[in-house]
Interface confidence: low
């Protein structure tokens, strides 16, 4: 399954929306910085598009879940959040269409299950951090910057897969 060209553009738009959501400078939040342990190797190890798509889907689904909470709605501009949801939703649709077309519908390899679990644990660490920091503006800014970084790394993987084919 070939992801449409619009999917790549949608990824760029998602990054740009995350950038627009910035409310305060990360420089003023240096004491709140945290290493969430993004499981980069889980993306780098998936050489088959069939293996990668479910992991990417999980990543985007978790971002959607994170930013669609009540606490998130209070933290960010409503209009930007709505645009952000729309972009994520479209990307989930693109990825789901690939799964329906037969990519990854065979038995799920254990390696892929492990990768999905690693992504879920990563987002659990982010959620726990936000709770511990009582959803402070700096905590949200640290998380916004982290999601930009991890989303960018995962979309770079998509691009490298596209160029390999």
């Amino acid at each position: 399954c070939d992801l449409p060209q619009t999917h790549s553009l949608g990824s760029r738009r998602t990054l740009m929306l995350l950038a627009q959501m910035r409310k305060i400078s990360l420089f003023s939040c240096l004491k709140d910085r945290h290493d969430f342990g993004f499981p980069q190797e889980e993306f780098g190890n998936q050489f088959q598009k069939a293996e990668t798509i479910p992991v990417l889907h999980e990543m985007i689904q978790q971002i959607f879940n994170l930013f669609s909470t009540k606490d998130s709605s209070a933290a960010w501009d409503e209009t930007l959040l709505d645009k952000f949801y729309t972009e994520l939703y479209q990307q989930l649709n693109d990825l789901e269409a690939c799964v329906i077309q037969g990519v990854g519908v065979t038995e799920t390899p254990l390696m892929k299950e492990d990768s999905i679990l690693a992504v879920r644990k990563y987002f659990q660490r982010i959620t726990l951090y936000l709770k511990e920091k009582k959803y402070s503006p700096c905590a949200w800014e640290v998380v916004r910057a982290e999601i930009m970084r991890s989303f960018s790394l995962s979309t770079n993987l998509q691009e490298s897969l596209r160029s390999k084919e």
């Epitope: 740009m16 950038a19 627009q20 910035r22 400078s25 990360l26 420089f27 240096l30 501009d77 209009t79 930007l80 910057a145 930009m148 960018s152």
Partner: antibody
Framework: MSQLVESGGGLVQPGGSLRLSCAAN???????MSWVRQAPGKGLEWVGS????????SIHRKFQGRFTISRDNSKNTLYLQMNSLRAEDTAVYYC?????????WGQGTLVTVSS | KTQMTQSPSSLSASVGDRVTITCDGT??????LAWYQQKPGKAPKLLIY???YHDFDVPSRFSGSGSGSDFTLTISSLQPEDFATYYC?????????FGQGTKVEIK
Amino acid sequence: MSQLVESGGGLVQPGGSLRLSCAANNDIEFNAMSWVRQAPGKGLEWVGSISPKGGSKSIHRKFQGRFTISRDNSKNTLYLQMNSLRAEDTAVYYCARDLGFMDIWGQGTLVTVSS
Amino acid sequence: KTQMTQSPSSLSASVGDRVTITCDGTYGISNELAWYQQKPGKAPKLLIYDGEYHDFDVPSRFSGSGSGSDFTLTISSLQPEDFATYYCQQYGNWPHTFGQGTKVEIK
């Protein structure tokens, strides 16, 4: 994607005033906006910024008291009012969408201050 | 005020060359730095934001790196359309400031 078009530039005498406009082809209500200028053969210089609703304005220290920035979201237009103009204000003035970084720019309007 | 110092101020290179431009700030600015390309008579065009992210339609030969106060723009293989002036801009401290520019000329 928004497109920005500046207007209002031209030749003005030292001490004179000009009001520059920046019209957007779609909604800029949710974006901070900035003015950036560039003197002939020189680099880029930030002039000032305004928040989405216009409640917060920031002008570079060197222009305070002479330049004011405003916006009319109902007209999707940004303004730069320049008073007491000097020869060193001669430059191309750009408006831009400001996300911290500036991702959408107008084509610029030339302001020439000369007697 | 955060002063941004770009180097070199100009350079001559050939098509296919790898080109590196640096931007140093007087204060740390986390990753809040952008790179722009400007051609004569045209408005600047955003290339990279937040230190490393490409804007729409920016070729992958352009890459940004660095954080804190030292940043780099790299063009991996210079193309004829890349001859232009490049500016960095910090937005981590107020007021937002631009570097003085680096002119990339044909050797």
